[in-house]
């Protein structure tokens, strides 16, 4: 159930966002999210995921790219890019490991 928090073992992830309490966080998985708001440069946030694993499988768009992985600090050196304005129609989404 994607709405309920995971009760599995926790993984330690790099945390880089305004809401981080420290340099790492613990969660069910690690995340990297690249977001571009209208008229602004893209911003990349690293952190932990506990809810909505289905976001990990969403395909990149010109506004957001969501990456997930499941090992210790696996999100530390990941860099994402946004999809071009006209994305290819057959580009598969990924759930990175």
């Amino acid at each position: 159930d994607p709405v309920k928090p995971s009760r599995g073992p926790l993984v330690t992830c790099t945390c880089e966002s305004p809401h981080c309490k420290g340099p790492t966080c613990r969660g069910a998985w690690c995340t990297v999210v690249l977001v571009r708001e209208e008229g602004r440069h893209p911003q990349e946030h690293r952190g932990c995921g506990n809810l909505h694993r289905e976001l990990c499988r969403g395909r990149p768009t010109e506004f957001v790219n969501h990456y997930c992985c499941d090992s210790h600090l696996c999100n530390h050196n990941v860099s994402l890019v946004l999809e071009a304005t006209q994305p290819p129609s057959e580009q598969p989404g990924t759930d990175g490991q």
């Epitope: 305004p18 981080c20 309490k21 420290g22 340099p23 790492t24 210790h72 600090l73």
Partner: antibody, heavy 120, light 108 residues
């Protein structure tokens, strides 16, 4: 009850390397999932964070001190250490080791501190 | 880099309420911890996660955090509360722990 105890020379000469060790008792340095920290306090001044280290060797250093800091862990002795190179009188301070809370990162366990004076 | 600003000193009469502020740009989006330090002693955590209290800390100690100011409130102040108080946050943009300059609480 976790306890932390700093040890090392109280006097270091300028340009030399300051070396301190923190011994952890009442809990394993490697099995708890905690990071471990060093903080210092110049005489009569406020607190300054030096860095964090995890038992696996992952480190996070204060950017302003990063070029001079080395932190390490000895799991067999349940200790972690700080080395600060090329010291000057400005590094004279009370040095504390501490442990942040899991997830919250608030420093809930501290050593009693050790005064290190840099002087020739 | 991120800066936390505290008043150097706060004075309060016994039994009154002391409020110690910690100012920082949009500090309300960060998590604030507070420490008490008495002369010659190591700091002691008195409030974490903006307003949570560690076990053993009296209910008289509370915290709040919103906008550009976090506040440590000590109600029914006692002589034993006289100490230096420091706020602390993690600044992700510079990847470092930041402490406020400290506030000396004097009980009149």
């Amino acid at each position: 009850q976790v306890q932390l105890q700093e040890s090392g020379p109280g006097l270091v000469k300028p340009s030399q390397t300051l070396s301190l060790t923190c011994t952890v008792s009442g809990g394993s340095i490697s099995s708890s999932g905690h990071y471990w920290s060093w903080i210092r306090q110049h005489p009569g001044k406020g607190l300054e964070w030096i860095g964090y280290i995890y038992y696996s060797g992952d480190t996070y250093y204060n950017p302003s001190l990063k070029s001079r800091i080395t932190m390490s862990v000895d799991t067999s002795k349940n200790q972690f250490s700080l080395k600060l190179s090329s010291v000057t009188a400005a590094d004279t301070a009370v040095y504390y080791c501490a442990r942040p809370k899991l997830d919250d990162w608030a420093l809930d366990y501290w050593g009693q501190g050790t005064l290190v004076t840099v002087s020739s | 880099s991120y800066v936390l600003t505290q008043p150097p000193s706060v004075s309060v009469a016994p039994g009154q309420t002391a409020r110690i502020t910690c100012g920082g740009n949009n500090i309300g989006s960060k998590t604030v911890h507070w420490y008490q330090q008495k002369p010659g002693q190591a700091p002691v955590l008195v409030v974490y996660n903006d307003g949570d209290r560690p076990s053993g800390i009296p209910e008289r100690f509370s915290g709040s955090n919103s906008g550009n100011t976090a506040t440590l409130t000590i109600s029914r102040v006692e002589a034993g509360d006289e100490a230096d108080y420091y706020c602390q946050v993690w600044d992700s943009s510079s990847a470092r722990v930041v402490f406020g300059g400290g506030t000396k609480l004097t009980v009149l």
